[in-house]
C-alpha cells in the first residue's frame, strides 16, 4: 500500500514586493479523505494561510480550477506580496474527523521577498 505523499517541489521561492507568489503542492492520492490547508510556519503558533471552507483569504486563490474533478493540485497564489509575507509555507493534508486530524505535511517552501525594482 503506497502512503500518501504531499509534494512541495520548490524548497524556496523569491518574489519581488508587489508581485504574486505561486506556492506549489500536489498529493499522490485522493485518500485518506480530508482537506488540505496551507500554513505559514510550523508548530502551535503557525498561521493559517488558506482553507477553502472556513475563513476569508482575499489575497489567496487556488491555482487549479475549483470545479475540477478529482483534483490533486493544491497549489495557491498569493497576490500583492509584501516583506511581511516572508516565511516558510506548508501544505498540510488532514484526515477527516471531528475535528480533522493532521496527517502529513509537505516539506515546506520558503518565500523570500525582494525589494521592488525601482
Amino acid at each position: 500500500e503506497e502512503e500518501l505523499q504531499v509534494i512541495q517541489p520548490e524548497k524556496s521561492v523569491s518574489v519581488a514586493a508587489g508581485d504574486s507568489a505561486t506556492l506549489n503542492c500536489t498529493v499522490s492520492s485522493l485518500i485518506p479523505v480530508g482537506p488540505i490547508q496551507w500554513f505559514r510556519g510550523a508548530g502551535p503558533g503557525r498561521e493559517l494561510i488558506y482553507n477553502l471552507k472556513e475563513g476569508h483569504f482575499p489575497r489567496v486563490t487556488p491555482v487549479s480550477d475549483p470545479t475540477k474533478r478529482n483534483n490533486m493540485d493544491f497549489s495557491i497564489r498569493i497576490s500583492n506580496i509584501t516583506p511581511a509575507d516572508a516565511g516558510t509555507y506548508y501544505c498540510v493534508k488532514f484526515r477527516k474527523g471531528s475535528p480533522d486530524v493532521e496527517l502529513k505535511s509537505g516539506a515546506g517552501t520558503e518565500l523570500s521577498v525582494r525589494a521592488k525594482p525601482s
Epitope: E1, E2, L4, S28, S29, L30, I31, P32, V33, G34, P35, I36, L52, K53, P62, S64, D65, P66, T67, K68, R69, N70, N71, F74, R95, K96
Partner: antibody, heavy 120, light 108 residues
C-alpha cells in the same frame, strides 16, 4: 469504462449477517474513496458508509453493526452487515466517490445494486 | 445533520416543457450540491456537481444553479427519456452525506 458490480445480496433473518462485495474496474481503484448507498423499497437514497484508505465513516443507523473494507489488490469493496434488522431491507449500491476542487465527495459512478431482504 | 428538502414531491409534465426542481438546505452548504437522476429499476446517475457543473455526457438541457441554501435543477425542454426521480445531495458537511427526498417527474 468504469464498472461496479455488486454481489452478495439475498434473504436473511433478523439478527443475521451478510457480506456484500463490489468488484471495480476501469479506474485506479486504490486512490479513490468508495461508498455504499442504500434504497429501501419505494423510498429515497440513504448514505450508508464510505472508506478512504484506512479511514471509515458510517451512518448512525448502521454504526457498530456494519463494517466497510476494501482490498486494493483485488479492486474490491466490501460491506459486512451484522445484526441485520427489517429496516435494513434495501437495494445496496456501491458507488465511486469523486471530489471536486478542495471540497467534499459525491458519487460519479454507481453499480446496479444488490437487494438485501431481512425477513423472518 | 444537514436536511435537504426537495419540492415539489411530484411534477406532471408534458414533453417539451421547461421543468424546474427545487432543493433547499437547512444550513449553508456553499455550492457543495450534486443532482442525480434515477429511472425505475436503475441506479442513480450523476447529472450535476458543484451546484452547476454538468457531468461528462450530460445533455446541455440540464442545468443547475444556486448557492448557500437554495438550489435549482432545470431541464430546458423535457424529453421522454427524462422521466424519473431526481435527487439532490449535499457534501459540504459530512458524515452523513444527505440526500433530498426526491422529485418524481411523471408524464402529464
Amino acid at each position: 469504462e468504469v464498472q461496479l458490480v455488486e454481489s452478495g445480496g439475498g434473504v436473511v433473518q433478523p439478527g443475521g449477517s451478510l457480506r456484500l462485495s463490489c468488484a471495480a474496474s476501469g479506474f485506479s481503484f486504490s486512490i479513490y474513496a468508495m461508498s455504499w448507498v442504500r434504497q429501501a423499497p419505494g423510498k429515497g437514497l440513504e448514505w450508508v458508509s464510505t472508506i478512504g484508505a484506512d479511514d471509515t465513516y458510517y451512518a448512525d443507523s448502521v454504526k457498530g453493526r456494519f463494517t466497510i473494507s476494501r482490498d486494493n489488490s483485488k479492486n474490491t469493496l466490501y460491506l459486512q452487515m451484522n445484526s441485520l434488522r427489517a429496516e435494513d431491507t434495501a437495494v445496496y449500491y456501491c458507488a465511486k466517490d469523486s471530489t471536486v476542487g478542495w471540497s467534499g465527495d459525491f458519487f460519479d459512478y454507481w453499480g446496479q445494486g444488490t437487494l438485501v431482504t431481512v425477513s423472518s | 445533520e444537514i436536511v435537504l428538502t426537495q419540492s415539489p414531491a411530484t411534477l406532471s409534465v408534458s414533453p417539451g416543457e421547461r421543468v424546474t426542481f427545487s432543493c433547499r438546505a437547512s444550513q449553508n452548504v456553499r455550492s457543495d450540491i450534486a443532482w442525480y437522476q434515477q429511472k425505475p429499476g436503475q441506479a442513480p446517475r450523476l447529472l450535476i456537481y458543484a451546484a452547476s457543473s454538468r457531468d461528462t455526457g450530460i445533455p446541455d438541457r440540464f442545468s443547475g444553479s444556486g448557492s448557500g441554501t437554495d438550489f435549482t435543477l432545470t431541464i430546458s425542454s423535457l424529453q421522454s427519456e427524462d422521466f424519473g426521480v431526481y435527487y439532490c445531495q449535499q457534501y459540504y458537511d459530512w458524515p452523513p452525506f444527505t440526500f433530498g427526498g426526491g422529485t418524481k417527474v411523471e408524464i402529464k
